[in-house]
């Protein structure tokens, strides 16, 4: 039976040309991580950080990508573009997978603030 | 090369205590999951539960509550099983083995030790 | 629990035989399903994980194959080596094994 519950930064926005933070949070389990998978909403694989060997940052991303904090990632260049969902796919034994979902807004503004208050999705 | 080392046979008499040891090599041990496996004598395989090797927390099957601890010496990679009031159902090999596997679809037993045959007689 | 039942228990073969052992889960495990070799006085080996992934350094004769509920280990053509015990396990949940099947020689 899975106990555990995955908390995120939930729904945040930032402004075009900075940078994010996308954090999640897996508690109220005993399982063991062995790996985490970042998503973007196309499905596409941005980033995986791995027990034994550390992070992967997907090539497409590499410039605008850096692993952390902590299990997290961090986007940078913002541009329009990187609205929508973000997905952290927490792989565990022996609970299975747990999945957090973060929605980013990039705005024009250059008054945007970056919120990163945590919710459970 | 990847493996576990387990500590040798023991003969124990009823009401003892055992403990097993399982050094892992080859590998960062933290980063990977250790099961307890038993077989008692001609019977199959029985998972008496697991250990997070990050925390050192221990998670029991049913029927290995009580007198079943398992923990860690993560700064010599070293996985121990001690069993106490040692009875003569308790007699079995017991091994230790990793889980195996990044992503949930891949977890397995990779790797087991040796096996440790534990006898309790009086 | 999810509980594992292997059959058959026993098998007797030749070698050459093609050789099917089935595994069945009391509810569904998608595909986290692994199977191990077991010989006397030997520890257990993987053979497949992933329900048909064949771990490295095991020979092609072995294939697995299932999802869900239904599983089964097959052995193309069956070496004199391969006489031993075969164990289903699933591997996420609360792990369990099989009870075994005993390949012997006919």
């Known amino acids: 039976m899975m106990t555990g519950t995955i908390e995120t930064t939930g729904n945040i926005s930032a402004k075009k040309g900075g940078s994010v933070i996308l954090q999640c949070h897996l508690s109220s389990t005993m399982a063991q991580v062995t790996q985490v998978n970042w998503e973007q909403h196309d499905h596409s694989l941005l980033a995986i950080r791995n027990a034994e060997l550390g992070w992967h940052i997907y090539p497409a991303f590499k410039d605008r990508v850096a692993p952390g904090p902590g299990l997290g990632l961090t986007l940078q260049s913002l541009t329009m573009n990187d609205t929508g969902e973000y997905f952290c796919t927490y792989h565990t034994y022996p609970d299975g997978t747990y999945r957090g979902r973060i929605f980013l807004e990039v705005l024009e503004s250059s008054v945007a603030e970056h919120s990163a208050r945590f919710q459970i999705p | 090369q990847m493996q576990l080392v387990q500590s040798g046979s023991e003969l124990k008499k009823p009401g003892a205590s055992v403990k097993v040891s399982c050094k892992a090599s080859?590998?960062?041990?933290?980063?990977?999951?250790m099961n307890w496996v038993r077989q008692a004598p001609g019977q199959g395989l029985e998972w008496m539960g697991w250990?997070?090797?990050?925390?050192?927390?221990?998670t029991y099957a049913q029927g290995f509550t009580g007198r079943f601890v398992f923990s860690l010496d993560t700064s010599v990679s070293t996985a121990y099983l001690q069993i106490s009031s040692l009875k003569a159902e308790d007699t079995a090999v017991y091994y230790c083995?990793?889980?195996?596997?990044?992503?949930?679809?891949?977890?397995?037993?990779?790797?087991w030790g040796q096996g440790t045959t534990v006898t309790v007689s009086s | 629990d999810i509980q594992l039942t292997q059959s058959p228990s026993f098998l007797s073969a030749s070698v050459g035989d093609r050789v099917t052992i089935t595994c069945r889960a009391s509810?569904?495990?998608?595909?986290?399903l692994a199977w191990y070799q077991q010989k006397p006085g030997k520890a257990p080996k993987l053979l497949i994980y992933?329900?048909?992934t064949l771990q490295s350094g095991v020979p092609s004769r072995f294939s697995g194959s299932g999802s869900g509920t239904e599983f089964t280990l097959t052995i193309s053509s069956l070496q004199p080596e391969d006489f031993a015990t075969y164990y289903c396990?699933?591997?996420?949940?609360?792990?369990?094994f099989g009870g075994g099947t005993k390949v012997e020689i006919k």
């Open positions: 992933a329900a048909s």
């Open positions: 080859g590998y960062t041990f933290t980063s990977y999951p």
């Open positions: 083995a990793r889980t195996g596997g990044y992503s949930v679809d891949e977890y397995s037993f990779d790797i």
């Open positions: 509810q569904g495990i998608s595909s986290y």
């Open positions: 396990h699933q591997t996420i949940f609360r792990p369990t």
């Open positions: 250990i997070n090797t990050n925390t050192g927390n221990p």
